[in-house]
Structures are given as C-alpha cells and as structure tokens.
Interface confidence: medium
Amino acid sequence: GYKAEVMVSQVYSGSLRVLNRHFSQDLTRRESSAFRSETAKAQKMLKELITSTRLGTYYNSSSVYSFGEGPLTCFFWFILQIPEHRRLMLSPEVVQALLVEELLSTVNSSAAVPYRAEYEVDPEGLVILEASVKDIAALNSTLGCYRYSYVGQGQVLRLKGPDHLASSCLWHLQGPKDLMLKLRLEWTLAECRDRLAMYDVAGPLEKRLITSVYGCSRQEPVVEVLASGAIMAVVWKKGLHSYYDPFVLSVQPVVFQACEVNLTLDNRLDSQGVLSTPYFPSYYSPQTHCSWHLTVPSLDYGLALWFDAYALRRQKYDLPCTQGQWTIQNRRLCGLRILQPYAERIPVVATAGITINFTSQISLTGPGVRVHYGLYNQSDPCPGEFLCSVNGLCVPACDGVKDCPNGLDERNCVCRATFQCKEDSTCISLPKVCDGQPDCLNGSDEEQCQEGVPCGTFTFQCEDRSCVKKPNPQCDGRPDCRDGSDEEHCDCGLQGPSSRIVGGAVSSEGEWPWQASLQVRGRHICGGALIADRWVITAAHCFQEDSMASTVLWTVFLGKVWQNSRWPGEVSFKVSRLLLHPYHEEDSHDYDVALLQLDHPVVRSAAVRPVCLPARSHFFEPGLHCWITGWGALREGGPISNALQKVDVQLIPQDLCSEVYRYQVTPRMLCAGYRKGKKDACQGDSGGPLVCKALSGRWFLAGLVSWGLGCGRPNYFGVYTRITGVISWIQQVVT
C-alpha cells in the first residue's frame, strides 16, 4: 500500500541585513511598540522570502527575535518540514544559497516582489546556520531577559548584570564588522552556582558554543573569550538566589591578530622565545589558524616545544580535536589540557625548517595556548638527566624518585640516590662527597670539588649556570660557586635563642620562627611557613572548600606558640594574594602547595624568621631525622593543640611509601614517619613545615604536611608536598 512519507523538522537560525532601515534603541526593548511593529513587518518579509523559493513547500514557521546595528540587522529562526530523505540535501549552506539566489534575482527587477515591499535586503549580508528545536527552546527561555548591546571600536562595555527575577538571561553582543569580540568574565564571589555559556553567534546554538563556565570557578577567576567575528551571545542560567551579581561581564571589539611567524633560532640551547594563540591568555577563537615556521641553525639540534598544562597526543580515527589540532611535519596531533608540564621534541632532519600549525577544529575552544620553543642537542637531549619519552621532559635520573610516569628514570641505575665511585662503580652516600674525607678507593669522591663540573641530578646549579659537585652546598658558610651564589639569600633557617602533633612535645618560643598559623575568624585552620619577607607557604588543600577561597577570610599569625593567648613576639597579617599551584589536583593531592602574600612585609625578630628553601637538586636522604611542627590534633579525631607541638620523623624511601599507599605517591610527594606509627602529623597540621637540619645548622624546608591515612597509624607514613618538586614554581612567584 501507499506509505506516507516521513517528514522531519529542520531548524535554521540566521541573520539578514536591511539596507533601507536604521537600528534604534527602541528596538532593544521587546515591550516597545517600535519592536512589536518592526518584528511583525520583518517576520512577514522573512516568510515571503522563504516561500518565494522552492523551500516554500516545506515552510513551517519562523520568528524574528531580535534586531541589531548594520544599518539594521534582523536575527531570526525558521523551521522547514522536510521529507527525511531530503534532509541532508537541505544543509544550511544550500538553504543560504537558495535564498541569496532569490534575493539576487530581484535586485534590479521592477516587478513587485512581496518581500521587497518595505525592506531592501542585502544578499551579501544573509547568514544561515544549523539549529535545533532545543536551541530554539533555550532561546525562548531567555527572551524575558534579552539584552542587545552594540560595542563600538575602542570601547569597553561593561554589561548590566542579569535580572535576578529571571532564571535565564541572554546578552546579544555585536561589534563593528571585520573586528572580533573579546568578552571578559570576572567572578566576584567565592561561591556560586551560576552557569554562563558563550556562543559564536547571536543565539544559543549548541553547535556554536565557544565555552561554558560554572560556579565561580577558582581555577579561572578571570576568563577572557574571543569570538571568531563581531557577533556573540552570552547566556546566563541562575544558580543560588543572590542579591549580588557573582560576576562582572565586559566586552570590547579587537582587531584580528595574525598568527603567522617565521623565526630563525640561535645557535644555543634552552628556551629562545614564546609562541601563543592571539590575545593569550584569552581563549583562542573558534576559527583560529596559526602557522609558525621555525628554522634551526644546524642538524645537530632538534626543536623542543615546552607546554604548560597542555600536551599533544595522537588522535585515533581522524576524530576532531576538541582542544586544538596541531600539525607538525605532517603529523596530526590533538591538544589536551593536563595538570602537568609537557614537552614535544621534534627531531630535525632537514635544514628547511619546521612548520607548526595550530587550528581550532570545532567552535568549542579553551584557554589560549602558549608554548616556549628552543633547541636541544639531538645526541644528548638531557645532559646529566634522563629524557622521559612519555612527556618529553628532562628529569633527574637515579635519585630514588620515579619522575617519569613509566619509572624508566630509576631503571638500570648503577647507584641510586648515592654517588658512584669512578674506580670500581661502588656507591657511597651523598653526604660523603666533597666532605674532605676520601671514601672511594682512589678518592674520586673528593676530586673536582673546587671546580665546575657537568650538571647532573645531584649537582648544584650556580647563578651563572655552572654546576658544583658538592651536594647541598647552599648556605654552608663557604662559597662553592665561582660567583658565590650558593651563599646568597642565606638569611634563613636559624632558630631563635631558645633552650602537638601525634607523639610530639611542646615547642618553645622562637624555636620554629618560620611557623605560621593560618586562621579564619579566630580559628586555627592550617599551618604554614614563612619563606620570604612577604610570603608564607602552605598546602593548597587548605583552600579546597569554596567557602575558604577568599583572601579576606584569612589571618596569618607568625611568632605564635600558644593558640589561646598572645605574647609580645607574635605578629599578624592579612592576605593580599592567594596563589594555588596551577597543577594542583584535589583528588590526588598532587602539587599540594599554595603561596600567601602578606599585606605588609615581616619585621624579622628572634621569633619571626624565614626557613631556607632548598635548590631543586637538594637531596634529603632517606633515613634522615627531620621535624614537623603544628597545632594539629594530638590524636586521630581529637581537637587541635593549644601549644605548638614538634615531633621528629624519619624520611622514608619513595619506593616503600609508594607501595604502602598503592602507588598514589607522586614525584611531588615525600614520605616521613615511622613504620610503627606513633609519631605523625594530624588534622590541623596541614600546610605546616617538615624541616631538616643541614650540617651548617640551618633548617631547610623539605615538605609541607599534605595527607596520609589517619594519624600515627602503623605502616602508614605521613605524606608531604616535596618542596624540591615545586621549587621552580615557588621561586617564579616569590621573585
């Protein structure tokens, strides 16, 4: 029998330009009579235009929902009922071509054409995009709170906040032709559940979503988003009821930035410059295409690209790259945001140079991408270190810590975390190197102690970038570096003149002058340590809860011993800046470190002094007795201590600790404690210092109290943030 043809609804969204009308502010108010009258006329014109083409037989409904500048731009959607088998034949491109063809055919015609009765439509200004029923529903839900704004060249327009009686609002933004819009979002509250979505078109079309942000993100307190052109839509969905806008939105038109460059690299190793997407750190725009051509001076070198929190991966089956597509020497790679550093190493085989292309394959974009570029020696990519093939990074080899995810940096070591004698490859402990006492058969541990040596895992790098053989030479009272830099910044790590933690003892005043108490509303929350005149270091997890994220909540006490009373040596500070490590991951506790900038510099005294920071190469030997201090609970689940407690703990080899915690211990962690438990940090000690005393008598910061299973439990050591693993970030921030 006859089978009825299946019809499907095909939704289109778009805009057209009217040359004989001008936009007026009245048209931004949906309740105005001007808006109602203009919509009625525009709607009639749109329907007549569609029905004048062979699309007429499929016409179902249409709506003009907004107007804009240019002289007058009408924004609309319409629905066609199409036989299912013709669905693909009527793509937005085909529909646009049919409508343009119709408009062009009547441009010079003297005949009366219904849709030209009032409007002179510009054929070149017609845009048709694919939409969905869901998109139209989303659009309709915002029409009660619909804001149109035109922003002129050189202007920065701050958008009026949402109407809190509405559950959803839409800002329709437009700028001058040939410019692109840059939207800036700044979260102003510590906590909220609001959702904002940015689109590369006038309405909320899911397929043209640039990005969506949610709930006063602490990771991104400020977000800048680029559209591909002069039109953009921002949709707000209400979270918790609030009388205050949890965000500030501003928009400005910016010129297109070319993203093409030809560079010739110098004949030297290390980073030589930076490549980035336009307007970095803004999100890259949906139609970004960058092409960088780099010429390498010699085939001895390869090209290294160092990324920050972004990696390149091979993508299976030609699927689109959702976080940026890269082509490097005809290899297609996809970008991936990660909470780790990453390097891509490109072997150079021809002097023609290397072309690197970056493209946003889909409208969904992400934070701008920045990459440092430089050369590496192809025959020895990581002098004195190990090249980790998993992430392209140079990592310390044979130091007892698996820095490379596959652990190969700790494989095939002749001597692990020890010094290898030249004579017979026997291994001696590092403190015995350059100590004036020959321990190797022919004394090779005492050779080259007064001269520069090739840099390696345990060598100390001086400011002039030369290296010295003596392990841990910092601040030991004798210059080992030619430039004396190992004895600079040494006003640290000395205890004041002074004669709970689980299993601990009470500290005396001035005994741990770097110890900080981080308090909220008079209540001790976390420990910390003074590392410079305006900087206190602590654990990032202290600020994990949204309610703890604001700097205004925190007071930092230094020189404190007793929680319930004050003494003259005690000082307090407000916090002007709070910086969490950019790679901090709450679930894994990785990179558990934060820096607090104090509102004014400390005045050093017997009770208030900074602790010494170790160099990246500083070796804290397993078995070493170090100390933790804090006001944390004296027993698991107990209340915090009134007196500052101190307890000695032993540093544990990474491999053992990793086994105990089922391989959740990362290279940025360090373990200390005892296998029998009893002595350990506990709740309230978080962020507090784990310090080790050097032979010079100075105390160096080895770790920060981070996590562990319970407190003082047998077999479960305390896990600390390994300071040498995050020192480069600390130095970058503090200096």
Epitope: E410, R411, N412, C413, R416, A417, T418, C427, P622, G623, Q650, I652, P653, D655, L656, E659, Y674, R675, K676, K678, K679, P714, N715, F717
Partner: antibody, heavy 124, light 110 residues
Framework: EVQLVESGGGLIQAGRSLRLSCAAS????????MYWVRQIPGKGLEWISS????????AYADSVKGRFTISRDNAKNALYLQMNSLRAEDTALYYC?????????????????WGQGTTVTVSS | QSALTQPPSASGSPGQSVTLSCTGT?????????VSWYLQHPGKAPKLMIY???KRPSGVPDRFSGSKSANTASLTVSGLQAEDEADYYC??????????FGGGTKVTVL
C-alpha cells in the same frame, strides 16, 4: 635474653596439614615484623612469609601462596605458620626470624634474630 | 620470584680479603637498597652481618663491608680469619613485601 623457639615440626604425609609455632621472649614482640624462612638440608635459605606487628600486611612466597597461612598472637608473643596440602618439596628446616631492631625505623627487610629451627619432613 | 645468584664457593688465606658477589635483577638488588648478608656456620642459625647494602649491626667486626653496583651486591671480608669459614647468603627486598635469598656461597679459609 632475646630468643625465638620454634616447635610443631615432625614427619607428616603429603597432603596433610601441620601448624608451626614460634615463641618469642626477651623483646617487645608487637613492635617487630616477623618472618618464616626455610632451608632444605644442604641447600640455601628460602623466604616463606612475613607479617607486620599489627598483622595488617602479610606476604607469601609464590611457592606456598594459598597453602600456608602466617598469623601472630601478640598477647601470647607467638608466631604461627599453618601449613596445608603439604608436598614432598616442603621438607625443610623451618626458621622463625625477627626483623632487625631499630628505633621506630622504617622497614629493613633484614633479620637479626633467628630461632634454631624446627624440621618438617613430608613423606610421599 | 627467582633466587639471587651467588657463586657456590670462594676461598682465601688467613689475613687476605675475599669478595663475594650477589647478582639480582633491576627489580630487586638493582632497584632497592635493601640488600642483607648472612653468615651461617654448619648446624647453626644464620647471623645478620650487613643490612641496607653496607650497614653493619652492632657486634659485627668492621672487617665485613658491603657495597652495590647496578644489579650486583658485594660482601668483602678483609683480614680473613679461621672463624669466617661458613656459608654466606645474600638477600634483597623484591617489592610487594617479598624477600628473595641467594643460593649461598661456601667460603673456605685455606
């Protein structure tokens, strides 16, 4: 005097079970990891099993896994090895050993006190 | 887990030095610094001589010294004495709370 004394060995038929005991004295038993190690006459030492002081980490050699069970009773200062499904190749002198003493130190995997051993002979 | 490899025998005259080797893999001796050495006189229980590659328990003479290079650990007995004649066993931690022993070396004082 620090001492470990094994008992419970003897002649046993293959497939049967036997339970070895080790009585500890002269030291704080519940602060030490304990081990069972065996030695086939005229041959080398073979680690069999270990148990931490609170019995929360237990490990076995592949050769005995699923057949032998180590346990301890800290109140009685005693270590046990329950041996099931015995085989001829289990014939050996069985030593109980204590992990090296140390002031709260981390694991040494070294045994500083040994008993004199108890002989187990499995006949097929 | 497979046993560590030790030479079956070694010998030296009184006053001389003898070095015993113990070869494992990169997963035991090569990876961990938990190599121990034991001395066993006939009919007696083993006695701990070295732990953590090179540390001596109290009461062990300093004639006994340990070292390690890559996957091989060594025990050196210098100033050999008659009472040093015995079987020597090495052991290593092998991960996952397991310990592995060597087959033993019989040392003869000539």
């Amino acid at each position: 005097e620090v001492q470990l004394v094994e008992s419970g060995g003897g002649l046993i038929q293959a497939g049967r079970s036997l339970r070895l005991s080790c009585a500890a004295s002269g030291f704080t038993f519940d602060e030490h990891v304990m081990y069972w190690v065996r030695q086939i006459p005229g041959k080398g030492l073979e680690w069999i099993s270990s148990i931490t002081w609170k019995s929360d980490i237990i490990a076995y050699a592949d050769s005995v896994k699923g057949r032998f069970t180590i346990s301890r009773d800290n109140a009685k200062n005693a270590l046990y090895l329950q041996m099931n499904s015995l085989r001829a190749e289990d014939t050996a002198l069985y030593y109980c050993a204590r992990e090296k003493d140390g002031d709260f130190y981390y694991y040494y995997f070294a045994m500083d006190v040994w008993g004199q051993g108890t002989t187990v002979t499995v006949s097929s | 887990q497979s046993a560590l490899t030790q030479p079956p025998s070694a010998s030296g005259s009184p006053g001389q030095s003898v070095t015993l080797s113990c070869t494992g893999t990169s997963s035991d001796v090569g990876y961990y610094n938990y190599v121990s050495w034991y001395l066993q006189h006939p009919g007696k229980a083993p006695k701990l001589m070295i732990y953590e590659v090179s540390k001596r328990p109290s009461g062990v003479p300093d004639r006994f010294s340990g070292s390690k290079s890559a996957n091989t650990a060594s025990l050196t007995v210098s100033g050999l004495q008659a009472e040093d004649e015995a079987d020597y066993y090495c052991s290593s931690y092998a991960g996952s709370n397991k310990v592995v022993f060597g087959g033993g070396t019989k040392v003869t004082v000539l």
